[in-house]
């Protein structure tokens, strides 16, 4: 897995977008797509060091 951001602070939460929870906003096509199509940080296996958990809002960034 890739290294993720060091910390995910509350003020980084994105403004609302029209994406449903299972989708992420694709900045390049300016549309919501399945999150699996984008290289977004993914949870690591238990026991592995990982960044702070993503909030429910983050996939819509």
């Amino acid at each position: 897995m890739r290294r993720g951001p060091r910390s995910l602070r509350g003020r980084d939460a994105p403004a609302p977008t029209p994406c449903v929870p299972a989708e992420c906003f694709d900045l390049l096509v300016r549309a919501c797509v399945a999150c699996g199509l984008l290289r977004t940080p993914r949870p690591k296996p238990a026991g592995a060091s990982s960044p702070a958990p993503r909030t429910a809002l983050q996939p819509q960034e």
């Epitope: 890739r2 977008t17 390049l28 699996g36 960034e61």
Partner: antibody, heavy 118, light 113 residues
Framework: DVQLQESGPSLVKPSQTLSLTCSVT????????WNWIRKFPGNKLEYMGY???????YYNPSLKSRISITRDTSKNQFYLQLLSVTTEDTATYYC????????????WGAGTLVTVSS | DIVMTQTPLSLPVSLGDQASISCRSS???????????LHWYLQKPGQSPKLLIY???NRFSGVPDRFSGSGSGTDFTLKISRVEAEDLGVYFC??????????FGSGTKLEIK
Amino acid sequence: DVQLQESGPSLVKPSQTLSLTCSVTGDSITSGYWNWIRKFPGNKLEYMGYISYSGSTYYNPSLKSRISITRDTSKNQFYLQLLSVTTEDTATYYCAGLDGLYWYFDVWGAGTLVTVSS
Amino acid sequence: DIVMTQTPLSLPVSLGDQASISCRSSQSLVHSNGNTYLHWYLQKPGQSPKLLIYKVSNRFSGVPDRFSGSGSGTDFTLKISRVEAEDLGVYFCSQSTHVPPFTFGSGTKLEIK
């Protein structure tokens, strides 16, 4: 960890075609955006273009119709072709992966220096 | 395309000094979603660029806290509070707000005075 490695000739003659391969391990090129970026002598970085998860491409208009980016998903590789090169295309060429949450280039190849000279 | 203007081009410093690099964009980098996609990279000699700061002020994993980013709109700054030998190299700002194309600053070479 995701790793990228560029390969291809280090010397190309003027008017010929520059062809490079980026081999990706640790991630699938059917997810995300895969990019080519070059650095000229003197430190200028130029974004060249991408191929996306769907196979769609974007090319920087500065490269006009000289550029082509393709992929082979079975090999997990993507490719750069630059036609009709001149000495102005002498640069270090990097392939890079794009983070899809914060939109930065999170993983880069080591880069390959391509010299255009007769 | 968005033009990223970086100053200075060369920054001679003494080890332990503070260093400051400025980056100015030709348009505001605030995206319609409220985020500002301004990032900083460091390219050490013989290496590829590596991400230091993402979205103006967030340090990437493993980046020492002597690095800090600030700014808004069109004006951004990268500060190194106490320069160490391992910090030497070329620093680039980059924007991902108005894309494609992604654009980069002209680079600032941090070197020993």
